[in-house]
């Protein structure tokens, strides 16, 4: 792995891609949404060390003020870097529909 | 203001572009940039309460299951939507070079 | 495991109607949606409807509308197509395939042979 | 209706070659394109799902790439029991279409 894929505080604890298991009542869909009835969610969560998976320049920059400024600028923060694309099947006013999202779930995550 | 704009912890809480300024060596740049020698850094802080600047489903999704389960999935986070392009003079082997770098500068933020 | 159980062959007259079935088990019926697929000898895939089977919602191929109706029973974990007004046209191989994410097909029945003839 | 064009009709592979599959939408569906195989007789299986995402399963041997209109599928190193129809699947819209289908043959 290259040294920004190397998580310093140990296996699973640094920036990367988790599954988290939610019903539509979970998600708040339940009044809109008809399928699927569940939906494996991935989501980018984990800690942002030094050099972690750095999105680009401007994560340096932010995590370099905040070794300085700790109370001033937050560290980096774990988001998506791409999305898997999702159907769903939607309650409309005439009846079902389906749409199609590309920004539903994540497919890999970056420190920005 | 649209509803996903107004943010309910008060002016000045919520994820929104601040200033921050900073010299070369608080960057970490004094051995590869000779100019600028100062940076008005901007980038992206603050809270990201329920429905504010959410940047796409993703963060819908990330905030209902925050809400459900807070030790395990942590609240969407403050990040650049957009990037200001910013000019560095840098030194090289043979003398220097102009760069822009187009992810330096944060230019307007969301929720992710 | 998931198993979609359909009805054996069926040799109708035209004009005649004809109610094919897929019998679930191995999941939660009302779990995932069921869809019919059309397929004529030698040829491709026709996607014919979505039935939602928790409430019975279904949605056509406007080239069906009127020539299918999708049903289910939850208590026998049951789906059902009915198809009208039957012609040579309508002989064909039909599928079930139940769907946990309604963009693809990830179980299928094995398939009902219906031969349309005088 | 998203008209789905695969080609080639046929093709006639010896067990071992690398092999693509083409599937061509009659307009852009981003990533929603499906990948089924269908042996004589039996129910089609889906291989791939939106575009890329391999299923638990399914060999590895199969992959999927495209998006957009252009899709393929690559087998890399056939083998005997890959002998039969495949299929491509669109889920941009309603109603769901599939393409005419790609014979995989002995050669």
């Known amino acids: 792995a290259r040294n920004g894929d190397r998580c310093p505080l140990g296996p699973g604890r640094c920036c990367r891609l988790h599954t988290v298991h939610a019903s539509l009542e979970d998600l708040g869909w339940a009044d809109w949404v008809l399928s699927p009835r569940e939906v494996q969610v991935t989501m980018c969560i984990g800690a942002c060390p030094s050099q972690f998976r750095e999105a680009n320049m401007h994560a340096q920059i932010k995590m370099n003020l905040h070794r300085l400024k700790p109370d001033t600028v937050p560290a980096p923060c774990c988001v998506p870097a791409s999305y898997n694309p999702m159907v769903l099947i939607q309650k409309t006013d005439t009846g079902v529909s389906l749409q199609t999202y590309d920004d539903l779930l994540a497919k890999d995550c970056h420190c920005v | 203001a649209r509803n996903g704009d107004r943010c309910p912890l008060g002016p000045g809480r919520c994820c929104r572009l601040h200033t921050v300024h900073a010299s070369l060596e608080d960057l970490g740049w004094a051995d590869w940039v000779l100019s600028p020698r100062e940076v008005q850094v901007t980038m992206c802080i603050g809270a990201c309460p329920s429905q504010f600047r959410e940047a796409n489903m993703h963060a819908q999704i990330k905030m209902n299951l925050h809400r459900l389960k807070p030790d395990t999935v942590p609240a969407p986070c403050c990040v650049p939507a957009s990037y200001n392009p910013m000019v560095l003079i840098q030194k090289t082997d043979t003398g220097v070079s102009l760069q822009t770098y187009d992810d330096l500068l944060a230019k307007d933020c969301h929720c992710v | 495991q998931v198993q979609l159980q359909q009805s054996g062959p069926e040799l109708v007259k035209p004009g005649a109607s004809v109610k094919l079935s897929c019998k679930a088990s191995?999941?939660?019926?009302?779990?995932?949606?069921i869809n019919w697929v059309k397929q004529r000898p030698g040829q491709g895939l026709e996607w014919i409807g979505w039935?939602?089977?928790?409430?019975?919602?279904?949605k056509y191929n406007e080239k069906f509308e009127g020539k299918a109706t999708l049903t289910v029973d939850t208590s026998s974990s049951t789906a059902y197509m009915e198809l009208h007004s039957l012609t040579s046209e309508d002989s064909a191989v039909y599928f079930c395939?139940?769907?946990?994410?309604?963009?693809?097909?990830?179980?299928w029945g094995q398939g009902t042979t219906l031969t349309v003839s005088s | 209706d998203i008209v789905l064009t695969q080609s080639p009709a046929t093709l006639s592979v010896t067990p071992g070659d690398r092999v693509s599959l083409s599937c061509r939408a009659s307009q852009s569906i981003s990533y929603y394109l499906h990948w089924y195989q269908q042996k004589s007789h039996e129910s089609p299986r889906l291989l791939i799902k939106y575009a890329s995402q391999s299923i638990s399963g399914i060999p590895s041997r199969f992959s999927g790439s495209g998006s957009g209109t252009d899709f393929t599928l690559s087998i890399n190193s056939v083998e005997t029991e890959d002998f039969g129809m495949y299929f491509c699947?669109?889920?941009?819209?309603?109603?769901?279409?599939f393409g005419g289908g790609t014979k995989l043959e002995i050669k």
């Open positions: 699947q669109q889920s941009n819209s309603w109603p769901y279409t």
């Open positions: 191995g999941y939660t019926f009302t779990s995932y949606d």
């Open positions: 039935i939602y089977p928790r409430d019975g919602i279904s």
């Open positions: 395939a139940g769907t946990s994410d309604p963009a693809y097909f990830d179980y």
